[in-house]
């Protein structure tokens, strides 16, 4: 499944919320839509 | 000003495959995934997944996966959602969207205008 | 998976009265302070349209008589006082999680 992060301090893997570090900023791929950051 | 254009209404047999598209305008293909949502007549909506312009990454509700596969075209700034082995559940109004993320200002939806996929014997 | 349900199935409201629409998840859709649930107003049809985001915040041009409350697990939609034009089908849904989710769906129509 596809990987990516929100810039609030979490990420999606598996389709499951995890924290993690550092932050992504929105010139890392497309905007998700409807979240905080995500970009894939 | 952003439009999703879709393509025209599909009938197709049981078992077959349907591939519709959703072409962008007045953005950046690149800097938004296009979500998918069906309809089936009188239902609600149903999510089955995006896929990402910038890196091709596609994430599909698992109800979908094996059947579903969602690709882009940066050329054209078009998507496409193929639905494999039709069942005649599958016949429903097909959405292409866009959305924003949550800000601090606001949100936009940007939604096609709808494919009818029909699938009958 | 989360689920998302929502009450009443059918609301018929007087014009310029009250509608409220009830939506529960089966799990709760916060994370980091924030509700991860919108709602979207469909009418016949067109495509959905973005009513409320992040369960409170206004969607963009949305009139002021929709507002969103609620977090974790129970949220409302509200319309303050009823207008012929907002005969409709109401979704909610959560963006918190893939898959994402919708509630079957709230029909308002003119008592």
């Known amino acids: 499944d596809a990987e990516f992060r929100h810039d609030s301090g979490y990420e999606v893997h598996h389709q499951k919320l995890v924290f993690f570090a550092e932050d992504v900023g929105s010139n890392k791929g497309a905007i998700i839509g409807l979240m905080v950051g995500g970009v894939v | 000003q952003v439009q999703l254009v879709q393509s025209g209404a599909e009938v197709k047999k049981p078992g077959a495959s349907v591939k519709v598209s959703c072409k962008a305008s007045g953005y950046t293909f690149t800097t938004y995934a296009i979500h998918w949502v069906r309809q089936a007549p009188g239902q609600g909506l149903e999510w089955m997944g995006f896929?990402?312009?910038?890196?091709?990454?596609?994430n599909y509700n698992q109800k979908f996966k094996g059947r579903v596969t969602m690709t882009r075209d940066t050329s054209t700034s078009t998507v496409y959602m193929e639905l494999s082995s039709l069942r005649s559940e599958d016949t429903a109004v097909y959405y292409c969207?866009?959305?924003?993320?949550?800000?601090?200002?606001?949100?936009?939806?940007?939604w096609g205008q709808g494919t009818l996929v029909t699938v009958s014997s | 998976d989360i689920v998302m349900t929502q009450s009443p199935d059918s609301l018929a409201v007087s014009l310029g009265e009250r509608a409220t629409i009830n939506c529960r998840a089966s799990e709760s859709v916060d994370n980091d302070r924030i509700s991860f649930l919108n709602w979207y107003q469909q009418k016949p049809g067109q495509p959905p349209k973005l009513l409320i985001y992040a369960a409170t915040k206004q969607g963009t041009g949305v009139p002021d008589r929709f507002s969103g409350s609620g977090s974790g697990t129970d949220f409302t939609l509200t319309i303050s006082s009823l207008q012929a034009e907002d005969v409709a089908v109401y979704y909610c849904?959560?963006?918190?999680?893939?898959?994402?989710?919708f509630g079957g769906g709230t029909k308002v129509e003119i008592k």
């Open positions: 896929t990402s312009p910038y890196s091709g990454v596609s």
């Open positions: 849904q959560q963006s918190k999680e893939f898959p994402w989710s």
């Open positions: 969207a866009r959305f924003d993320n949550y800000p601090r200002g606001y949100v936009r939806d940007y």
